[in-house]
Interface confidence: medium
């Protein structure tokens, strides 16, 4: 959580941002909130990025003002116009690129004063894994697949029954470059699994951690997936 204050005493307002991560090729949100004003026309929102000359986005007098927007963000940004009045200055970023990573500043002017806060935005690729029984294999085998990751993650298997066991010698993980030559498909195979057990395939890079669970008995196979973004710190 980053909370920023305006520079000049009583004319400062609180601005809060949350560090977040964007999934390349998808839409992302850069989160920013501020003390609301009663008049929309008195609110100015500016988004800036360190190292970028033009603005990322500007909203003033109730509408977008994009005359000074940097070329790299052209047609890719929007604020939630109907929520600005209640103090939401978050920015929607379309088609997130690797190069969108960096430090952003959310700068706010209202009739009460000014304020700003920085936000660290990471970009990469992350996806939910799915774990299935691989009936094509010649031993009892599980296959964990996740379609898009970047940077290259680590993959670790765990089991409810054999807690703390090291499965590295009975598993095999491969990374296959996807067609856009950035993200990779993750495939990990676990051998010699046993019935009546729950196995977890955990995929992690510096942006996200995802887990795919599978419980196998003779009468049911239950799957569950979970994805968590790392370092989502508010400022």
């Amino acid at each position: 959580l980053i909370i920023g204050f305006g520079i000049s005493g009583r004319h400062s307002i609180t601005v809060t941002t949350v560090a977040s991560a964007g999934n390349i090729g998808e839409d992302g949100i850069l989160s920013c909130t501020f003390e609301p004003d009663i008049k929309l026309s008195d609110i100015v929102i500016q988004w800036l990025k360190e190292g970028v000359i033009g603005l990322v986005h500007e909203f003033k007098e109730g509408k977008d003002e994009l005359s000074e927007q940097d070329e790299m963000f052209r047609g890719r940004t929007a604020v939630f116009a109907d929520q600005v009045i209640v103090g939401n200055a978050s920015l929607r970023l379309k088609n997130v690129q690797l190069t969108d990573a960096g430090t952003y500043k959310c700068y706010i002017i209202t009739s009460k004063g000014k304020g700003n806060a920085n936000l660290e935005y990471k970009t990469g690729a992350f996806s939910m894994p799915e774990v299935n029984v691989d009936y094509n294999a010649s031993s009892e085998t599980l296959r964990c697949e996740a379609p898009r990751w970047f940077p290259q993650p680590t993959v670790v298997w765990a089991s409810q029954v054999d807690q703390g066991a090291n499965f590295s010698e009975v598993s095999n993980t491969s990374f296959e470059l996807n067609s856009e030559n950035v993200t990779m498909k993750v495939v990990s195979v676990l051998y010699n699994v046993t019935i009546n057990n729950t196995y977890s395939c955990m995929i992690e890079n510096d942006i996200a951690k995802a887990t795919g669970d599978i419980k196998v008995t003779e009468s049911e196979i239950k799957r569950r997936s979970h994805l968590q973004l790392l370092n989502s710190k508010a400022s």
Epitope: Y135, S138, T217, E218, S219, E220, I221
Partner: antibody, heavy 119, light 108 residues
Framework: QVQLVESGGGVVQPGRSLRLSCAAS????????MHWVRQAPGKGLEWVAV????????YYADSVKGRFIISRDNSKDTLYLQMNSLRAGDTAVYYC????????????WGQGTLVTVSS | EIVMTQSPATLSVSPGERATLSCRAS??????LGWYQQKPGQAPRLLIY???TRATGIPARFSGSGSGTEFTLTISSLQSEDFAVYYC??????????FGGGTKVEIK
Amino acid sequence: QVQLVESGGGVVQPGRSLRLSCAASGFTFRSFGMHWVRQAPGKGLEWVAVISYDGSNEYYADSVKGRFIISRDNSKDTLYLQMNSLRAGDTAVYYCAKGGGLRWYFAYWGQGTLVTVSS
Amino acid sequence: EIVMTQSPATLSVSPGERATLSCRASQSISSNLGWYQQKPGQAPRLLIYGASTRATGIPARFSGSGSGTEFTLTISSLQSEDFAVYYCQQYNSWPPLTFGGGTKVEIK
């Protein structure tokens, strides 16, 4: 408990079609691959076809390939076998079977439905 | 395809005696073998999977052994309800999944 109940068998003329159904209960049907196995009168067991848990993959015995279609409706917990261009050699009791939790042995079987192909 | 061969075709045993059934695979199938029991007019029932693991509810008198290409089902002391046809099945390599031709265990 696991239950598999086949239906749809009967007498049919060569060259005609028949559709078998298998209603499943007592387990999470949508999570398991399902099979059809048949047994000609007085003969042994012959595996016919399998369909993956989500219906995305099907495999067939050579003897029925191109004539039989296995399918499933996970919303109805039902397995199907569409049998086309039937021959006298297809006469058998057809069993629906559930794959084991980790491998393709047949953990549970239905009671079977008799298909007789005769003119 | 993997061919499964069972022997003998018929086994005559007295109640209380031991019965030994054999199953041979045309190539190695590791331990990926199941044994089934079928009584007249009934569906088959899984006895053994993984060559040696008894399925749920199967009495301890049934045991399986072997790996690779040679497998054995042993019934230590035959009960009257054990007289039936027994099939082995490989699930190591498929399609197709293949069964042996069966062994009929009859009363001597």
